[in-house]
């Protein structure tokens, strides 16, 4: 029925699944499902019935708005959630929310693959290491971002003296969090400290 919303949240957080419109008037029953056929909770205009599921004890329904509150979401809660409203006419209306739960990214470690002084220029190869995650990388030299084409897990570049930076930062991020790792060099082109 076309009402599909995407939500991305951080694991361990509390989540509200709700629709952006008022519930239809005079419905007969409201039910929340996950993975299409697993009932979480049902409201019949008088009381809520919570079903045996992995959510029991972690969910609460607001019958006035239809919102479903889930506490302490984990990656295993990734699913399409469906709010189905049964009208007295027998017609059904559905809203779908695709929930993606992501762990916060860990702090990256910068590994110095190679530093080499080449004719007053500095060849630099740094890698930004985090355990297998799907993340975005942004490199900074003294807090100035490097060009977009250099933004991946490995920074490989040759710097002229006027472009030298003392410290290099790798920022890893996903849609729910970001963390930085920094390495500093002794000018012009040697390792100082991590």
């Amino acid at each position: 029925q076309g009402h599909l919303v995407h939500m991305t949240v951080v694991s361990g957080s509390n989540v509200t699944l709700n629709i952006s419109e008022s519930l239809p008037e005079n419905y007969k029953q409201l039910t929340w499902f996950y993975t299409f056929d697993q009932k979480i909770v049902e409201w019949d205009s008088r009381k809520s019935k919570y079903f045996e599921s992995k959510f029991k004890g972690r969910v609460r329904l607001d019958p006035q708005s239809g919102a479903l509150y889930i506490s302490k979401v984990q990656k295993e809660d990734n699913s399409t959630y469906i709010m189905r409203v049964l009208k007295k006419t027998g017609n059904e209306q559905e809203w779908k929310i695709k929930l993606q739960v992501l762990d916060p990214v860990p702090k990256p470690v910068i590994k110095i693959e190679k530093i080499e002084d080449m004719d007053d220029n500095c060849y630099l190869k740094l890698s930004c290491v985090i355990p297998g995650e799907s993340v975005n990388y942004t490199w900074y030299g003294d807090k100035r971002p490097f060009p977009k084409e250099l933004q991946n897990s490995v920074l490989e570049t040759t710097l002229m003296p006027h472009n030298y930076s003392r410290c290099y930062t790798c920022q890893v991020s996903n849609s729910v969090s970001s963390k930085n790792g920094t390495v500093c060099l002794s000018p012009p082109c040697t390792l100082a400290r991590s």
Epitope: E25, D62, Q64
Partner: antibody, heavy 119, light 107 residues
Framework: QVQLVQSGSELKKPGASVKVSCKAS????????MNWVRQAPGQGLEWMGW????????SYGNVFKGRFVFSLDTSVSTAYLQISSLKAEDTAVYYC????????????WGQGTLVTVSS | EIVLTQSPDFQSVTPKEKVTITCRAS??????IHWYQQKPDQSPKLLIK???ESISGVPSRFSGSGSGTDFTLTINSLEAEDAATYYC?????????FGGGTKVEIK
């Protein structure tokens, strides 16, 4: 059975404030929204707005934005209406009315609280 | 906002007579109309919801009909205890609104 019991009549001077309470019993308070309705002497019913008793979020009718505040104490299943900077034209009976479980119908009403504003 | 116009404003009726009160909405509201009865010095009481759905404990002489913009509350055989003011209310859109009321008096 569902019961809504409101606080007693109030006589206030212009500029003062008043807080009307509505204590609910006989049902799960946080499952059903609470509406407020005003009836001026000899006049009809006027919807003021409602409060979501699950989240505490109020929603006000256009005429009632500003001096009127809906609030809750869910630990004692009670809704409140506070009116500040009272004017003579606020003289009315104020009703709380429970929202029906599947729509904006008022299926149970309090007995009403008369607020008189006079110098 | 949706304006609800009730007619008549006042009706004087003999017992056992049939009473018809109409409520006209300024725009279509489906079947989202409700009827309340308010006796003197009492709070309103829900009589009919969603045009024609009966309410537990309300005598069967009260019924409702209509759709779209025109709605009717019918009291089939009026009794003395039915002396009251009757209000319609719409729940189709915000803000919720009431009709101006129809006062029914027993002759």
């Amino acid at each position: 059975q569902v019961q809504l019991v409101q606080s007693g009549s109030e006589l206030k001077k212009p500029g003062a404030s008043v807080k009307v309470s509505c204590k609910a019993s006989g049902y799960t308070f946080t499952d059903f929204g609470m509406n407020w309705v005003r009836q001026a002497p000899g006049q009809g019913l006027e919807w003021m707005g409602w409060i979501n008793t699950f989240t505490g979020e109020p929603s006000y009718g256009n005429v009632f934005k500003g001096r009127f505040v809906f609030s809750l104490d869910t630990s004692v299943s009670t809704a409140y209406l506070q009116i500040s900077s009272l004017k003579a034209e606020d003289t009315a009976v104020y009703y709380c009315a429970r929202r029906h479980g599947n729509g904006n119908v008022f299926d149970s009403w309090g007995q009403g609280t008369l607020v008189t504003v006079s110098s | 906002e949706i304006v609800l116009t009730q007619s008549p404003d006042f009706q004087s009726v003999t017992p056992k007579e049939k009473v018809t009160i109409t409520c006209r909405a300024s725009q279509s509201i489906g079947s989202n109309i409700h009827w309340y009865q308010q006796k003197p010095d009492q709070s309103p009481k829900l009589l009919i919801k969603y045009t024609s759905e009966s309410i537990s404990g309300v005598p069967s002489r009260f019924s409702g009909s209509g759709s779209g913009t025109d709605f009717t509350l019918t009291i089939n055989s009026l009794e003395a205890e039915d002396a009251a003011t009757y209000y319609c209310q719409q729940s189709n859109s915000w803000p919720l609104t009431f009709g101006g009321g129809t006062k029914v008096e027993i002759k």
